[in-house]
Amino acid sequence: KESCDVQLYIKRQSEHSILAGDPFELECPVKYCANRPHVTWCKLNGTTCVKLEDRQTSWKEEKNISFFILHFEPVLPNDNGSYRCSANFQSNLIESHSTTLYVTDVKSASERPSKDEMASRPWLLYR
């Protein structure tokens, strides 16, 4: 019999390398049964996790799983760090493993793009 507890499927020690200036979507896979839980994102700052209330979030529903998405429009250098999603379900707080974003900049990327490329939008150039 399948559990009807809420589950958050972020893999332990998962990480993403992303470029400053790119749009990015950080997904928290959420499994639930009847009522969709209230999910939030926070960013780790030492031992505390600071709730991200000023960022755009959205839900993407798929057949067997849903995704609570944190949007970066665009990524800035200070978005570097570790993030966690958490769900409130029947008065219980369920926390995911943390996922780490490594933000790199064009100036520190291994191949330095041309001046024209730098002026072009990165989501066309760095797919």
Epitope: L19, A20, G21, P74, L76
Partner: antibody, heavy 119, light 107 residues
Framework: EVQLQQSGPELVQPGASVKISCKAS????????MIWVKQSHGKSLEWIGN????????TYNQKFKGKATLTVDKSSSTAYMGLPSLTSEDSAVYYC????????????WGQGTTLTVSS | NIVMTQSPKSMSMSVGERVTLSCKAS??????VSWYQQKPEQSPKLLIY???NRYTGVPDRFTGSGSATDFTLTISSVQAEDLADYHC?????????FGAGTKLELI
């Protein structure tokens, strides 16, 4: 030549709403972020928010969340900023600017739209 | 929020003089600082991005320098057309923030 053409000045009563437009030309509209900036009293600049014309994704300054609404119309290469329930504090010049260099530097600016809220 | 503090608030210079404008960030912003020139009754124009990169078409008398928290815009030999407000801004962290500006006046 890249151009951002903003709508004309607005004189409105307190409590009214406005929608300022910014028509882009001379580049591919969906390739660059559009940014909105407020300038009060001809001096300091305040970032309102960004919109990605590709998908409509936004990031707002918390101060303007619920105050400004950023949208785009890809078919006409136009960005919009809606401001509801206006007060005298909203009187300012509003600029749209293109986020042309990563991560987010503003390389082209509209001419500005002057909003005056007065009874 | 990162506070960008510009100094001085205004300065009066003669044509040909060297001008140094300061911008200090309340916390480390690496080199994610830009400088904008705003002439009277005009919209801002990008001069410098990434603390030290001169934007296309900007005269080479304008030079940006600095990193972390202290940034400088230098005009090596000020011209009459440089009469303007100069704004610094950071794009290291949300919310993006600007300094209050420095007004450059000519004697």
């Amino acid at each position: 030549e890249v151009q951002l053409q903003q709508s004309g000045p607005e004189l409105v009563q307190p409590g009214a709403s406005v929608k300022i437009s910014c028509k882009a030309s001379g580049y591919t509209f969906t390739d660059y972020y559009m940014i909105w900036v407020k300038q009060s009293h001809g001096k300091s600049l305040e970032w309102i928010g960004n919109i990605n014309p590709n998908n409509g994704g936004t990031t707002y300054n918390q101060k303007f969340k619920g105050k400004a609404t950023l949208t785009v119309d890809k078919s006409s290469s136009t960005a919009y900023m809606g401001l509801p329930s206006l007060t005298s504090e909203d009187s300012a010049v509003y600029y749209c600017a293109r986020g042309g260099l990563r991560p987010l530097y503003f390389d082209y600016w509209g001419q500005g739209t002057t909003l005056t809220v007065s009874s | 929020n990162i506070v960008m503090t510009q100094s001085p608030k205004s300065m009066s210079m003669s044509v040909g003089e060297r001008v140094t404008l300061s911008c200090k960030a309340s916390e480390n912003v690496d080199t994610y600082v830009s400088w904008y020139q705003q002439k009277p009754e005009q919209s801002p124009k990008l001069l410098i991005y990434g603390a030290s990169n001169r934007y296309t078409g900007v005269p080479d008398r304008f030079t940006g320098s600095g990193s972390a928290t202290d940034f400088t815009l230098t005009i090596s030999s000020v011209q009459a057309e440089d009469l303007a407000d100069y704004h610094c801004g950071q794009s290291y962290s949300y919310p993006l923030t600007f300094g209050a500006g420095t007004k450059l006046e000519l004697i």
